[in-house]
């Protein structure tokens, strides 16, 4: 025969632990019912009567199955320069993150204890790894045939472009300048003399340098934070 | 409310080391980061570091890396700055201060520790 | 390290004049720039955080605007308890760094 169900409150066996969702009563020395989450005990069990629960209070909270006399306070409403990432409910406690361009330096249970700015790569190196709300950002030099002409938390090193006469060759801070192609090469019928890169790679916004421009020695300096993040030595 | 309340003044001889506290109250003391902030006589202020008495982080100016050691003594809700190897130069006002939010920005301060290094 | 120049060192006004403190970041700071309002022998006062929102308690008559290198404080109409010196701290990164103060003095 199969084992009856007990129905709470009950005794439980000697050396037994009460079932899932459930609690020991010491008062009433019974397996009683636990509330659920957004929910709190309004009345304890007694050796006749199961739990009582109740739902939390407006900016009150329960996250877990449970039996305390009151949900618990949501935290106080996010300031002015920080991003409500999670509402207050019944069931869970606001949570507060940095405003944007910023991440979680120093967290704490629900938040953070202490944000800076995401490491902004320098000219020369490209982000490798984007920043997240708890991570800062990581930065690499760009590898040769790429290129990041920007101060930025989220560039990446790009591809040169594509020459058929190269007038300026690429560096880790500068994309490669093309020339017009060369009159004495011969050309298809109806080519254009343009001078645009070969390869069909979108085009991005900046402006080319001019010829004139020297080559930038950026990508060789060190690739440390601008500006340091939280608990770095700086350049 | 909050309150950072400082020890009294200081007179050392160079070279000696200094240890000044900050006792807190108002607040839980493991939830706040406590700054270390100093202003010489007739001049701008100086960010000496912070110190989280929570985890023992701590992110010191490198100015003062080789010199500075801030620690706590949680069972009485305060922190420490010990600065060593002093010079006539240290002689200054050292104020605790800490932030609300996660941004640094000090709403709330000690009343500040005269400090003076003279031989 | 980011420097924080802060001009003028000194300025004599009147009650009831209107006073402006400008601060100039080495480098981009967002809009991470606080002002303290600090009288002699006393610990700095938070003024204004976020380059322009006020601190708990703090009179309209104190605003703050700027972004990226360039902050100002602006005091409306001056009154008998602004005379104090005024600092700008960045609140961007490590190290936080102050300018050198504005010292505002009775004409």
């Known amino acids: 025969l199969p084992a009856q169900v007990a129905f709470t409150p009950y005794a439980p066996e000697p050396g037994s632990t009460c079932r899932l969702r459930e609690y020991y009563d010491q008062t009433a020395q019974m397996c009683c019912s636990k509330c659920s989450p957004g929910q709190h005990a309004k009345v304890f069990c007694t050796k006749t009567s199961d739990t009582v629960c109740d739902s939390c209070e407006d900016s009150t909270y329960t996250q877990l199955w449970n039996w305390v006399p009151e949900c618990l306070s949501c935290g106080s409403r996010c300031s002015s320069d920080q991003v409500e990432t999670q509402a207050c409910t019944r069931e869970q406690n606001r949570i507060c993150t940095c405003r944007p361009g910023w991440y979680c330096a120093l967290s704490k249970q629900e938040g953070c204890r202490l944000c800076a700015p995401l490491r902004k790569c320098r000219p020369g190196f490209g982000v490798a790894r984007p920043g997240t709300e708890t991570s800062d950002v990581v930065c690499k030099p760009c590898a040769p045939g790429t290129f990041s002409n920007t101060t930025s938390s989220t560039d990446i090193c790009r591809p040169h472009q594509i020459c058929n006469v190269v007038a300026i060759p690429g560096n880790a801070s500068m994309d490669a300048v093309c020339t017009s192609t060369s009159p004495t090469r011969s050309m298809a019928p109806g080519a254009v003399h343009l001078p645009q890169p070969v390869s069909t790679r979108s085009q991005h916004t900046q402006p080319t340098p001019e010829p004139s421009t020297a080559p930038s020695t950026s990508f060789l300096l060190p690739m440390g934070p601008s500006p340091p993040a939280e608990g770095s030595t700086g350049d | 409310q909050v309150q950072l309340v400082q020890s009294g003044a200081e007179v050392k001889k160079p070279g000696a080391s200094v240890k000044v506290s900050c006792k807190a109250s108002g607040y839980t003391f493991t939830e706040s980061i406590i700054h270390w902030v100093r202003q010489a006589t007739g001049q701008g202020l100086e960010w000496m570091g912070w110190?989280?008495?929570?985890?023992?982080?701590?992110n010191y100016n490198e100015k003062f890396k080789d010199r500075v050691t801030m620690t706590r003594n949680t069972s009485i809700s305060t922190a420490y700055m010990e600065l060593s190897s002093l010079r006539s130069e240290d002689t200054a006002v050292y104020y605790c201060?800490?932030?609300?939010?996660?941004?640094?920005?000090?709403?709330?301060w000690g009343q500040g520790t005269t400090v003076t290094v003279s031989s | 390290d980011i420097q924080m120049t802060q001009s003028p060192s000194s300025l004599s006004a009147s009650v009831g004049d209107r006073v402006t403190i400008t601060c100039k970041a080495s480098?981009?700071?967002?809009?991470?720039v606080a002002w303290y309002q600090q009288k002699p022998g006393k610990a700095p006062k938070l003024l204004i955080y976020?380059?322009?929102t006020r601190h708990t308690g703090v009179p309209s008559r104190f605003s703050g605007s700027g972004s990226g290198t360039d902050f100002t404080l602006t005091i409306s109409s001056l009154q008998p308890e602004d005379f104090a010196t005024y600092y700008c701290q960045h609140h961007y990164s490590t190290p936080y760094t102050f300018g050198q103060g504005t010292k505002l003095e009775i004409k």
């Open positions: 976020w380059t322009s």
């Open positions: 480098q981009d700071v967002s809009t991470a």
């Open positions: 110190f989280y008495p929570g985890s023992d982080n701590i």
């Open positions: 201060a800490r932030h609300e939010g996660p941004y640094v920005y000090f709403d709330y």
